[in-house]
Amino acid sequence: FPQTTEKISPNWESGINVDLAISTRQYHLQQLFYRYGENNSLSVEGFRKLLQNIGIDKIKRIHIHHDHDHHSDHEHHSDHERHSDHEHHSEHEHHSDHDHHSHHNHAASGKNKRKALCPDHDSDSSGKDPRNSQGKGAHRPEHASGRRNVKDSVSASEVTSTVYNTVSEGTHFLETIETPRPGKLFPKDVSSSTPPSVTSKSRVSRLAGRKTNESVSEPRKGFMYSRNTNENPQECFNASKLLTSHGMGIQVPLNATEFNYLCPAIINQIDARSCLIHTSEKKAEIPPKTYSLQIAW
C-alpha cells in the first residue's frame, strides 16, 4: 500500500488531496486488475470471479449462532448449487461510458466502455460517475496483463456458503468453507503490495492507449486464493486510515465524489482478505476453522 511521506492533513478546502486520492485509487485498481484483469480489461468472467471472491456473486444462506446455540456448520455446504440461478450479472449489464475498467476491448467501435467498481449511478449513464476523478477512464488499471485465465480458475460451485458464528462478545466471525476439486490449488496473491522502486514496464495493450514492453509469460495466478500472505501483507485499514491514505480529512463528511475514490480500496481490502486472520496464525477465543473479522470500522 503506498505510504505517503507528506503531511496527511490536506490543505484543500474541500478536505481532499485530489492528487493523492487519484494515485491511491489507481494503486488499488492496479491490484484488482492484476488479479482479475486480462489485456487491460476486466472480462465479464473476471468480474464474476471478483464478485465471487468477495462473496457477493450469489445469494447465500447465513446462520447467526449465539454462544449457547452451537449448531453444526456442515449443513450449509451446498448453498451455491442451490442458488445458481441467482447470478444477477449478465453480459450486457455492465456497460457504461466511463472509460474505466474495460469489460471488453471495444476496438472496433473506438469507444471504450468501462464500468466503475463502485458505481452509484445507472450503469448505462454516459460517464456518469463524478467520483472517478482519475477518470472514469482516467484509470486504465495498471497491472492488467493477461495473467488470468478464467478457465484455470475455480468454478463458483466449488465455494460454499458463508456462515457467521457469534461468540459471546457479540462479534461476528466469518467462516468461508472452501471445497476445491482434487488437485486444485488456491495460490497466494504474488503481486507485492509495495510498488517496485525502479520500473519502466507498462503491462498494457496498445488498444487501451498503453504500451506493452514485455511479453506476458509469467505464471498465471488462479482467481481463488486465501489471503494475502506476502512479506508485506496488505494492512487492514480502518475508516480513518482509508480516508487519510486517500488524502481525505477524517472529520469532514464524505460526499459522493469523495466516497467514490475509496471504492477500489474497499473492494481490494475485502478481496485481499486484509481484515481476516486465520485462527492458526493468531490465538483467539473463536471457534476452530474460522476466519476472524478484525474490527475495521
Epitope: T4, G127, N132, K136, H139, V204
Partner: antibody, heavy 113, light 107 residues
Framework: QVQLKQSGPGLVQPSQSLSITCTVS????????IHWVRQSPGKGLEWLGV???????DYNAAFISRLSISKDNSKSQVFFKMNSLQANDTAIYYC???????WGQGTLVTVSA | DIVMTQSQKFMSTSVGDRVSVTCKAS??????VVWYQQKPGQSPKALIH???YRYSGVPDRFTGSGSGTDFTLTISNVQSEDLAEYFC?????????FGGGTKLEIK
C-alpha cells in the same frame, strides 16, 4: 515543501529524441503519480501521459508509439523520453503531480536544425 | 477524446467587476474538472478541482460551478493580478484534455 524540478535540453534536432528528467521533493513517487503535459501556441495544453506509483504508465494514444516514461523511486526521479521529434513538437514540456498546482517549471524545447 | 471548449478566447473586464469564464465538455465528465490560471512565463496554477472546490490559498473571489458538460469559473471583484489566461481541464477520461484557454484582460 513539494517541488518538481525539470532538467533537459532546450534544442533538439529533427528526428532526434527528447529526454527530460523530473526530480521531485517533498513527496514520494511511491505515493503519487507523475503526469507530463506540454504547451504550444498552436495546440495549447496537451496531456501526454502518466507514470503511476507502481511504475506502470498511461499514455495519450496520439503519442504512444514514441513516448516512454519511467522512474527511479529511490532517486525521486521521473524520466520522460519522446522519439522522432519534429518541428510541431516544439513546446514547453511540464511534469506535474496530478490535477494540482504542483507543476515543474517547464522545459522549453525547440525542434530545429 | 473529450473536447473541452472555451468559446471565448478573450474577455475584457474592469477591476471590481464580476466575470464568468465558461467551459463545455463534449461528453459527460461529471465534476472531474480543474480550473487553472496561467500568468505569462509561469506554469499553470490550479485554482479549483472537482469543478467547485478551491485549493488552499486561492482567494474566495474565485468560485467554480457546474457538472456534466457545462462548467463555469466566476471571478467576483476582479483584481489587477487576475490578469491571466484561464484553462479548464477534465480528468474523467483518458486522455485528460484541456480547454483552449480564455485570456482575461483588464480594461
Amino acid at each position: 515543501q513539494v517541488q518538481l524540478k525539470q532538467s533537459g535540453p532546450g534544442l533538439v534536432q529533427p528526428s532526434q529524441s527528447l529526454s527530460i528528467t523530473c526530480t521531485v521533493s517533498g513527496f514520494s513517487l511511491t505515493t503519487y503519480g507523475i503526469h507530463w503535459v506540454r504547451q504550444s501556441p498552436g495546440k495549447g495544453l496537451e496531456w501526454l501521459g502518466v507514470i503511476w506509483t507502481g511504475g506502470t504508465t498511461d499514455y495519450n494514444a496520439a503519442f504512444i508509439s514514441r513516448l516512454s516514461i519511467s522512474k527511479d523511486n529511490s532517486k525521486s526521479q521521473v524520466f520522460f523520453k519522446m522519439n522522432s521529434l519534429q518541428a510541431n513538437d516544439t513546446a514547453i514540456y511540464y511534469c506535474a503531480r496530478g490535477p494540482s498546482s504542483y507543476w515543474g517549471q517547464g522545459t522549453l524545447v525547440t525542434v530545429s536544425a | 477524446d473529450i473536447v473541452m471548449t472555451q468559446s471565448q478566447k478573450f474577455m475584457s473586464t474592469s477591476v471590481g467587476d464580476r466575470v464568468s469564464v465558461t467551459c463545455k465538455a463534449s461528453q459527460n465528465v461529471d465534476t472531474n474538472v480543474v480550473w487553472y490560471q496561467q500568468k505569462p512565463g509561469q506554469s499553470p496554477k490550479a485554482l479549483i478541482h472537482s469543478a467547485s472546490y478551491r485549493y488552499s490559498g486561492v482567494p474566495d473571489r474565485f468560485t467554480g460551478s457546474g457538472s456534466g458538460t457545462d462548467f463555469t469559473l466566476t471571478i467576483s471583484n476582479v483584481q489587477s493580478e487576475d490578469l491571466a489566461e484561464y484553462f479548464c481541464q477534465q480528468y474523467n477520461n483518458y486522455p485528460w484534455t484541456f480547454g483552449g484557454g480564455t485570456k482575461l484582460e483588464i480594461k
